[in-house]
């Protein structure tokens, strides 16, 4: 009775529970041959399985984290716009982060991620969870690159103070550099937060998506020598 393929770690008990239910429901359908489970019950198994995985995903508080993600993205965006205004009005050399414009396109990505996470938290369909997972993985990668860019940007730009000194701090050069560095530091901090949130949401999304069994389930009925292989059809897009 207990022959089946497992796609999740042993500690993930949802699948085991689903299988136990399946074994309990196993009955021979009249005229269907010995030991073949009723196909109607398969949907119940899928639904039961997805319910458990949904709970796993919702445990990650996607709605709350999604809102936080959007708020951080908006803060980062406003920082970026302010930095650009300060830099362009100061007429000098700007931090690398201003040239790259990460705060603009990075924030857009995080807003999309956050929105998908909220949507997936409200209507936990596989499509939305998949979309949220994909965007959050992308956002994690983006956040890492942003952390690197901002670290380099801050380090290098700090040396611009030297050029301010050369001309005797013209047009409050030191003040401008300090403001831009402070904002760059804030963007760096926000990028770290974005990374933590995106990774956390990705982890919970992955628990729900990656732990969906897509393999073959072998049901060996006790009253038959014949083992029938019943492939699990994809879970219904609820």
């Amino acid at each position: 009775h207990q022959t089946y393929r497992r796609h999740c770690r042993p500690e993930e008990s949802t699948f085991s529970a689903a299988m136990t239910t399946m074994q309990g429901m196993e009955q021979a359908t009249p005229g269907a041959g010995p030991g073949v489970p009723q196909l109607g019950n398969m949907a119940v198994v899928h639904s039961h399985l997805w319910k458990g995985l949904q709970e796993k995903f919702l445990k990650g508080e996607p709605k709350v984290l999604g809102v936080v993600q959007i708020l951080i993205a908006l803060m980062s965006l406003s920082m970026g716009i302010t930095m650009m205004c300060v830099a362009f009005s100061a007429y000098g050399h700007y931090p690398i982060s201003v040239y790259i414009g990460y705060t603009i396109w990075g924030s857009v990505m995080f807003i999309i991620s956050g929105s998908l996470s909220i949507a997936a938290g409200i209507r936990t369909t596989k499509g939305l969870v998949r979309g949220s997972l994909g965007m959050n993985i992308t956002s994690s990668v983006l956040a890492v690159s942003a952390i690197l860019i901002n670290t380099i940007s801050l380090t290098i730009y700090s040396f611009y103070h030297r050029y301010c000194n050369y001309y005797g701090n013209p047009n409050n050069c030191h003040g401008t550099v300090s403001i831009l560095m402070g904002m760059d530091g804030m963007v760096l901090l926000l990028s770290v937060l974005e990374f933590c949130i995106a990774v956390s949401l990705s982890a919970f999304g992955c628990k729900a998506i990656c732990c969906t069994p897509g393999g073959v389930v072998l049901i060996i009925p006790s009253n038959s020598h014949m083992a029938e292989a019943a492939p699990l059809t994809p879970l219904n897009e609820v």
Epitope: Y91, F159, R162, Y163, Y167, N171
Partner: antibody, heavy 124, light 111 residues
Framework: QVQLQQSGAELARPGASVKLSCKAS????????MQWVKQRPGQGLEWIGA????????RYTQKFKGKATLSADKSSSTAYMQLSNLASEDSAVYYC?????????????????WGAGTTVTVSS | DIVLTQSPASLAVSLGQRATISCRAS??????????MNWFQQKPGQPPKLLIY???NQGSGVPARFSGSGSGTDFSLNIHPMEEDDTAMYFC?????????FGGGTKLEIK
């Protein structure tokens, strides 16, 4: 590419004034200091001063305060130097040059691009 | 102001040989671990052209035969091997502090 185009030769009377121009192209004019350098025939190079077209800041060497007035027009990406109360010792070639800045663990700044120069002749 | 003294005032070198021009500053031009010494080449009727910045870094498009060295107050420009096209005036310039100042120049000719 980065280019600095200077105005043509000037012939002036002693006591008169001349305004030299330096039109920049190929870079963001408002982000770099523009330098002005004097070279008398067969002599060395002498820094006059610098102007930042972006914020309008200027720096002069002591010798040229009152003699040279630096300015810039952002709309036409042109830097200007006015030389007043001309005397025979003001006869020289005047260059404009852009100052490039490289900052990092090792920071540098240097005059990387120069104009062809404007010859000013003061003669009665 | 920092005074730069170049030597020799003129120099004649055979083709393929090494030319060395010296520049001494009245005070150190080092700052932030960098030597703010630049070298320029000027041919008759032309503006100066940047050869070396930061004492030893080559300007863009400058042939490898031009090299700079030194720190503090003593610097030198080396040209090896000497080519016909290298006949020109050479100037050192400090950018440690405003006003930037230039050396008196060295006239390099072919022997």
């Amino acid at each position: 590419q980065v280019q600095l185009q200077q105005s043509g030769a000037e012939l002036a009377r002693p006591g008169a004034s001349v305004k030299l121009s330096c039109k920049a192209s190929g870079y963001t004019f408002t982000n770099y200091w523009m330098q002005w350098v004097k070279q008398r025939p067969g002599q060395g190079l002498e820094w006059i001063g610098a102007t930042h077209p972006g914020h309008g800041d200027t720096r002069y060497t002591q010798k040229f305060k009152g003699k040279a007035t630096l300015s810039a027009d952002k709309s036409s990406s042109t830097a200007y130097m006015q030389l007043s109360n001309l005397a025979s010792e003001d006869s020289a070639v005047y260059y404009c040059a852009r100052e490039e800045v490289y900052y990092g663990f090792r920071s540098y700044w240097y005059f990387d691009v120069w104009g062809a120069g404007t010859t000013v002749t003061v003669s009665s | 102001d920092i005074v730069l003294t170049q030597s020799p005032a003129s120099l004649a070198v055979s083709l393929g040989q090494r030319a060395t021009i010296s520049c001494r500053a009245s005070e150190s031009v080092d700052n932030y671990g960098v030597s703010f010494m630049n070298w320029f080449q000027q041919k008759p009727g032309q503006p100066p052209k940047l050869l070396i910045y930061g004492a030893s870094n080559q300007g863009s498009g400058v042939p490898a035969r031009f090299s700079g060295s030194g720190s503090g107050t003593d610097f030198s420009l080396n040209i090896h091997p000497m080519e016909e096209d290298d006949t020109a005036m050479y100037f050192c310039q400090q950018s440690k502090e405003v006003p930037p100042t230039f050396g008196g120049g060295t006239k390099l000719e072919i022997k």
